[in-house]
């Protein structure tokens, strides 16, 4: 999937599996991504896990999950709040959209979480105080935190080259993210389609293009605008919202 | 379609989620299934053609025949938890400051530095 | 996103018959009761129809009834609008609404009767 | 049948005023249940109808708070705040009390 950093650096990342997206002293968030094609390395969400820890005289530790298909508007035990103590209604979710969007509050913590179902897969987007990104115990266990920390170099796919690829007029038969690309998306319509939707050409726009050219499927030109939609919603610095191509640079410290 | 509202405000006034109910909780569990009904019934004409409506209807009704309940007698109100010590209102509110980040930081500095983080796409 | 793309109209002649299309997506098709509603040319809004989320049930307005059919294929995630014995008067934007009551809409596709 | 008669017809309102539109329906729209099944719909010029109000007075999700809907019984109303330019269309009430379904006539509002 394509990650927004808490650094505002912008990724594309092909980690299969599950891996910590936030892991801190109050909020433990997990995404499990699956590839989008047999055989490509261009992977999407397909399960999410977050935990609320309990915290003081707020709220009890609360799970919630979503997966493909499955959007639920509650907490894994079907309560809709913190639980029973004192301030538990400063952890509420509220579905925005029946099965397709739900945002949760966390106001003990200052937080507010989106999660989506676009077509098949999930988005996430989480605005966060730096007091709470930063409220680590062990600095060191920070390594794979996806939000603070970027993916591994090695985990990144280099959709600029991918474009230039794509942009040419012989496309190749196998760019390295997706061995078998969609011939029904020709890059002018890719183009057309996301522009559509994403009129400023910054890297959201460039994701929409890259994840039509790898699959096919134009609900992912709708994850782009929504991940944008809710970026302006959670983005405290409005100037910072677009973010536009410039080199590469190396996560901090991971391997 | 307000299906899922009656949903959840059963949830909440049966605390025992979907666990049978203690023999002397009986009487508590069918007046909440009574509500329950009462609130489907409301929703009829805008959920009736909807899976959700038909699967709280089917679901009532066997909860009615497992547990005995009669379709006549008391319903029951949302069930509001007790809270800690008295003196609040009966509304479980947001109180302890500590509950509420942005208020509890004003107290020893500026206002918060916010981040963003987002995940989509492939 | 919900999404309702209608298909399916054209010109016909009186007495003539058409089956009109409504293909959903970006919800769960299977679990929800769905409307035809129709709009004639310059005037306001008709209800139709309706037709619950297992087919067990359909609902029709009285200026159609016995005329119009509505069905549905779940697997198909699609929703149907039989018409037959189209008159004049049937000339309208069709137009297929999700849910019990109509919550989302399609855009609509014209349907004209006449000789 | 239920008629449901709306008024006035033409709204012609000031940017930045309020309007209300009335919606009369020939027979109570609460059911033995207690429940009022009443709706409002906009429709902008050359678009689909959009679901604004449900149950009377519950907003659709996306809906901004400007509008708002009230009523029991027999009598309706639909109120916006603080009219904008994006307001502008025809408006529609709706009930699902009874069988069959139907729609008032519409009100056109448009700025003055």
């Known amino acids: 999937p394509h990650l927004r950093t808490f650094t505002d650096h912008f990724q594309t990342c092909k980690v299969q599996g599950a891996w910590p997206l936030i892991d801190n002293n109050y909020l433990n968030v997990q995404v499990t991504n699956t590839p989008v094609l047999p055989g490509s390395a261009a992977t999407a969400t397909s399960k999410l896990t977050i935990i609320f820890k309990n915290f003081q005289e707020c709220v009890d530790q609360k799970v919630y999950q979503a997966e493909m298909d499955e959007l639920p508007s509650a907490f894994a035990d079907g309560s809709k709040n913190g639980g029973d103590k004192h301030g538990a209604n400063s952890l509420k979710i509220t579905e925005k959209v029946s099965g397709q969007h739900v945002e949760i509050q966390a106001k003990y913590i200052g937080t507010t979480i989106v999660v989506r179902q676009v077509g098949r897969y999930l988005t996430f987007a989480v605005r966060m105080p730096e007091e709470v990104v930063n409220a680590v115990e062990d600095r060191d266990s920070q390594g794979l935190y996806l939000c603070l920390r970027g993916c591994p170099l090695n985990q990144q796919i280099d959709f600029q080259a991918f474009r230039a690829n794509a942009e040419s007029p012989r496309r190749p038969a196998a760019a390295s993210p997706s061995p078998v690309v969609p011939e029904t998306f020709p890059y002018e319509t890719a183009v057309a389609k996301c522009k559509e939707k994403l009129p400023v050409e910054d890297l959201y726009y460039q994701a929409c293009v890259f994840d039509l050219l790898t699959t096919g499927d134009v609900n992912f030109t709708l994850a782009a605008y929504y991940a944008l939609e809710d970026g302006k919603m959670l983005h405290s610095n409005k100037d910072k919202l677009h973010l536009f191509e410039r080199t590469r640079e190396l996560p901090g410290a991971v391997a | 379609c307000k299906i899922l509202k009656c949903n959840s405000e059963f949830w909440s006034a049966t605390s025992s989620g979907s666990h049978a109910p203690a023999s002397d909780d009986v009487p508590e569990f069918c007046a909440a299934l009574r509500t329950y009904a009462l609130c489907t019934r409301r929703t009829a004409r805008t959920c009736r053609g909807d899976l959700a409506y038909h699967s709280a209807v089917h679901g009532i009704e066997d909860l009615m025949s497992q547990h005995n309940c009669s379709k006549d007698g008391p319903t029951s109100q949302p069930r509001v938890r007790t809270l800690p010590p008295a003196g609040d209102s009966q509304e479980r509110s947001d109180s302890p400051e500590i509950c509420h980040y942005e208020k509890s930081f004003h107290k020893h500095s500026a206002a918060p530095n916010y981040t963003h983080c987002g995940l989509f796409g492939d | 996103e919900v999404q309702l793309v209608e298909s399916g109209g054209g010109l016909v002649q009186p007495g003539g018959s058409l089956r009109l299309s409504c293909a959903a997506s970006?919800?769960?098709?299977?679990?929800?009761?769905m409307n035809w509603v129709r709009q004639a040319p310059g005037k306001g809004l008709e209800w139709i129809g309706m037709?619950?989320?297992?087919?067990?049930?359909?609902h029709y307005a009285d200026s159609v009834k016995g005329r119009f059919t509505i069905s549905r294929d779940n697997s198909k995630n699609t929703l149907y609008l039989q018409m037959n014995s189209l008159r004049a008067e049937d000339t309208a934007v069709y137009y297929c609404?999700?849910?019990?009551?109509?919550?989302?809409w399609g855009q609509g596709t014209m349907v004209t009767v006449s000789s | 049948d239920v008629v449901l008669t709306q008024s006035p017809l033409s709204l012609p309102v000031t940017l930045g005023q309020p309007a209300s539109i009335s919606c009369r329906s020939s027979?109570?729209?609460?059911?033995?249940?207690?429940?009022?099944?009443l709706e409002w719909f906009q429709q902008r010029p050359g678009q689909s109808p959009r679901l604004l109000i449900y149950?009377?007075?519950s907003r659709f999700s996306g809906v901004p708070d400007r509008f708002s809907g009230s009523g029991s019984g027999t009598d309706f109303t639909l109120k916006i705040s603080r009219v904008e330019a994006e307001d502008v269309g025809v408006y529609y009430c709706?009930?699902?009390?009874?069988?069959?379904?139907?729609f008032g006539q519409g009100t056109k509002l448009e700025i003055k």
């Open positions: 037709i619950y989320y297992d087919s067990s049930e359909k």
């Open positions: 609404a999700k849910g019990s009551t109509p919550d989302y």
């Open positions: 709706f009930q699902a009390t009874h069988d069959p379904l139907s």
């Open positions: 149950d009377v007075s």
């Open positions: 970006g919800f769960t098709f299977s679990n929800y009761g």
């Open positions: 027979q109570s729209l609460e059911d033995s249940d207690g429940g009022t099944f």
